[in-house]
Interface confidence: low
C-alpha cells in the first residue's frame, strides 16, 4: 500500500492507458488528477535563495553554502550537503538547483564568487586622544583582486545601530565600557566574511576634585585640602602661580591634603588642582581652582642708605626700598640718636629725610628701616657727625 500523502506534499495521482501508434511504437498516455496543490517550479521555489561564502585559507578557494531547508541537488553533481566546493575568487560559476519537492525548470543560480577573505582586514582606526568616547573601525584592502569593488558592501552592527559603511565612527560613548561590533562584507549582497570586535573604550578624563579649603597658615606656608574625583585616576597635579611664576607638583593619588612651604609672604597664590589618568594617552580632568594670600612677615632691610651733610647742622638721609616688602603698607622710618638718646623719629612715604637743626660737632647714629604696616624691617645703621659751625 502506498503511503498517504501529507498535506504539504505536492502529490499527483495518475492512471495510465497504453495504445499503439501508426509507427507501431507504444505510446503511453497519462491522465493526471491533482489531489493536492501542484508542486512549484524549482525556479520559483528557489527564486530568493541566499548564499554564504566560506573561505579556505589553505586552498584559497571558496565554498558556497546554499541557505535552503532541504538537501537540494545540483546539475553535474556539483554540490554536496547544499555546499558548492572549490570556487575561485572573483570568478562566476553557474549551478542548477533542483529538489523532489519542485518541478522543472531548475533554478539556475549564478555564483558570483567574492574576493579572498585575507585581502580584507578589520582595522581599529580610533584616535588614541579620543579613545575614551569614540570607536573607529575600518575595513582595509590589503591586497589587490579582480572583483568589481562596486559590488562590495560593508555592514556594521554595534548594539542596535546598523551602518552600511566601510568605516564607522561611534561618538559620545561612555568611557570604560565594552562595545561589541559585528561586521560583515557582502559581495553582490552575499556575505563572504565577517568579523567581531569587542572594544573597551579607554579611561575617561577624571572628574574635577572638590576643594574643601585652601588658605595661608603663615607667611611662608599654605594648605589645600580636597575630595578626590569619583572616576578612575592615577595622580594629581597641583600648580601654584604667583604673579607670572608657575610651579607644578605631581602628587600621589591617595593624598587629600598638601602643605605648601617656602612661599613668599604677603603674596597672592592661585592654585589649580587636577587629577589625571595615564591611559592610551594622558587625560587630565578639569582643574579646580582656589587662591589665598600669604600672611605678612618682616620686610627686608632698606639698602644703599646715604647720609650727606646739606649744611653745618642739617643732614640728608636717603635709602632704596627693601627687596621684599612682605606686607600691605609702605612706610620708611628714620631714628636719629645722639649717644643713647633718641633725638629724632620721623616717618615718610619715601626714604628721603631732611634732618635739620642738629647740634654742631656731634656724633649721630642714623637708623633707617621700612615698616609694612604689620612688621618693621631690620634697620640700616650709619654714623655721621656734624661739623663745627663755619660761622
Amino acid at each position: 500500500q502506498s503511503p498517504t500523502p501529507s498535506p504539504t506534499d505536492a502529490y499527483l495521482n495518475a492512471s495510465e492507458t497504453t495504445t499503439l501508434s501508426p509507427s507501431g511504437s507504444a505510446v503511453i498516455s497519462t491522465t493526471t488528477i491533482a489531489t493536492t496543490p501542484s508542486k512549484p517550479t524549482c525556479d520559483e521555489k528557489y527564486a530568493n535563495i541566499t548564499v554564504d561564502y566560506l573561505y579556505n585559507k589553505e586552498t584559497k578557494l571558496f565554498t558556497a553554502k546554499l541557505n535552503v531547508n532541504e538537501n537540494v541537488e545540483c546539475g553535474n553533481n556539483t554540490c554536496t550537503n547544499n555546499e558548492v566546493h572549490n570556487l575561485t575568487e572573483c570568478k562566476n560559476a553557474s549551478v542548477s538547483i533542483s529538489h523532489n519537492s519542485c518541478t522543472a525548470p531548475d533554478k539556475t543560480l549564478i555564483l558570483d564568487v567574492p574576493p579572498g577573505v585575507e585581502k580584507f582586514q578589520l582595522h581599529d582606526c580610533t584616535q588614541v586622544e579620543k579613545a575614551d568616547t569614540t570607536i573607529c573601525l575600518k575595513w582595509k584592502n590589503i591586497e589587490t583582486f579582480t572583483c568589481d569593488t562596486q559590488n562590495i558592501t560593508y555592514r556594521f552592527q554595534c548594539g542596535n545601530m546598523i551602518f552600511d559603511n566601510k568605516e564607522i565612527k561611534l561618538e559620545n560613548l561612555e568611557p570604560e565600557h565594552e562595545y561589541k561590533c559585528d561586521s560583515e562584507i557582502l559581495y553582490n549582497n552575499h556575505k563572504f566574511t565577517n568579523a567581531s570586535k569587542i572594544i573597551k573604550t579607554d579611561f575617561g578624563s577624571p572628574g574635577e576634585p572638590q576643594i574643601i579649603f585652601c588658605r595661608s597658615e603663615a607667611a611662608h606656608q599654605g594648605v589645600i585640602t580636597w575630595n578626590p574625583p569619583q572616576r578612575s585616576f592615577h595622580n594629581f597635579t597641583l600648580c601654584y602661580i604667583k604673579e607670572t611664576e608657575k610651579d607644578c607638583l605631581n602628587l600621589d593619588k591617595n593624598l587629600i591634603k598638601y602643605d605648601l612651604q617656602n612661599l613668599k609672604p604677603y603674596t597672592k597664590y592661585v592654585l589649580s588642582l587636577h587629577a589625571y589618568i595615564i591611559a592610551k594617552v594622558q587625560r587630565n580632568g578639569s582643574a579646580a581652582m582656589c587662591h589665598f594670600t600669604t600672611k605678612s612677615a618682616p620686610p627686608s632691610q632698606v639698602w644703599n642708605m646715604t647720609v650727606s651733610m646739606t649744611s653745618d647742622n642739617s643732614m640728608h638721609v636717603k635709602c632704596r626700598p627693601p627687596r621684599d616688602r612682605n606686607g600691605p603698607h609702605e612706610r620708611y622710618h628714620l631714628e636719629v640718636e645722639a649717644g643713647n638718646t633718641l633725638v629724632r623719629n620721623e616717618s615718610h612715604k619715601n626714604c628721603d629725610f631732611r634732618v635739620k637743626d642738629l647740634q654742631y660737632s656731634t656724633d649721630y647714629t642714623f637708623k633707617a628701616y621700612f615698616h609694612n604696616g604689620d612688621y618693621p624691617g631690620e634697620p640700616f645703621i650709619l654714623h655721621h657727625s656734624t661739623s663745627y659751625n663755619s660761622k
Partner: antibody
C-alpha cells in the same frame, strides 16, 4: 527643585503600543541618566533600562529589550518609554528616576498602564 | 543576574521600638573602588520609592538619623530606631554593581 513629571494613566488593548513621557525640570537634563523601573500591582520593583540624554546611549535589561524603546528629547528635557505588543503582563506602574552618582535620587510619580481587551 | 533576597517581618513593630530589615545578595556588591553599591528605599503606600541610604551606609539628604545602614559585601541591614507611624511602607534594597540593576522583593513594615 528637581521634578520628574510623568504622563497620565494609559488604558490599552493587547497587541497595541503605548508611549509615556517623563518631563524633567529643576536640573541639567543632559547631566544625569534617566532610569526606568516597572512595578506590577502588589509586586516589587524591576529595572528596565536607562538612557543617557546627552549621548543617546541606551542600556536595556535583556528581559525588556524586545518590549521597550527608550528615547529622549534634549530640547524639551523629556524622556520617553514606548512599550510595544502589549500583553496583560505589561499592566503595571512605570517610574522614571534620575540617577545621581550612586543612587536613584528623584522619582516620577509613576504612569499606570492597564492592558485590557 | 545578581539576586537580592529580603526577609519578611514576622509581626508588626510597636511604635518606639527598633527594627532591623535584612537584605542578602548572591554576589558581593563591594566594587573595586572600595564602595559597596547597595541602596535602601522606602515606598510608602500609594507613593513613589524614596531613597533612604546609599553606598550601604550613607544617609540620603533629609533622611532622619533614626535610619542607618550597615553590612558586608553580601549581607546588609537597615536599622530603624524609635519606629514611628510614618515609617510604614515597603523597604527595598537595590544593587547597582552590575547590569541589570536588581531590587530585593521588599520588606513590609507595619506599626502598631
Amino acid at each position: 527643585g528637581v521634578q520628574l513629571q510623568e504622563s497620565g494613566a494609559e488604558l490599552a488593548r493587547p497587541g497595541a503600543s503605548v508611549k509615556m513621557s517623563c518631563k524633567a525640570s529643576g536640573y541639567t537634563f543632559t547631566s544625569y541618566t534617566m532610569q526606568w523601573v516597572k512595578q506590577r500591582p502588589g509586586q516589587g520593583l524591576e529595572w528596565i533600562g536607562y538612557i543617557n540624554p546627552s549621548s543617546g546611549y541606551i542600556k536595556y535589561n535583556q528581559k525588556f529589550k524586545d518590549k521597550v524603546t527608550l528615547t529622549a528629547d534634549k530640547s524639551s528635557t523629556t524622556a520617553y518609554m514606548q512599550l510595544s505588543r502589549l500583553t496583560s503582563e505589561d499592566s503595571a506602574v512605570y517610574y522614571c528616576a534620575r540617577r545621581g552618582s550612586y543612587f536613584f535620587d528623584f522619582w516620577g510619580q509613576g504612569t499606570s498602564v492597564t492592558v485590557s481587551s | 543576574d545578581i539576586v537580592i533576597t529580603q526577609d519578611e517581618l514576622s509581626n508588626p513593630v510597636t511604635s518606639g521600638e527598633s527594627v532591623s530589615i535584612s537584605c542578602r545578595s548572591s554576589k558581593s556588591l563591594l566594587y573595586k573602588d572600595g564602595k559597596t553599591y547597595l541602596n535602601w528605599f522606602l515606598q510608602r503606600p500609594g507613593q513613589s520609592p524614596q531613597l533612604l541610604i546609599y553606598l550601604m551606609s550613607t544617609r540620603a539628604s533629609g533622611v532622619s538619623d533614626r535610619f542607618s545602614g550597615s553590612g558586608s559585601g553580601t549581607d546588609f541591614t537597615l536599622e530603624i530606631s524609635r519606629v514611628k507611624a510614618e515609617d510604614v511602607g515597603v523597604y527595598y534594597c537595590q544593587q547597582l554593581v552590575e547590569y541589570p540593576f536588581t531590587f530585593g522583593g521588599g520588606t513590609k513594615l507595619e506599626v502598631k
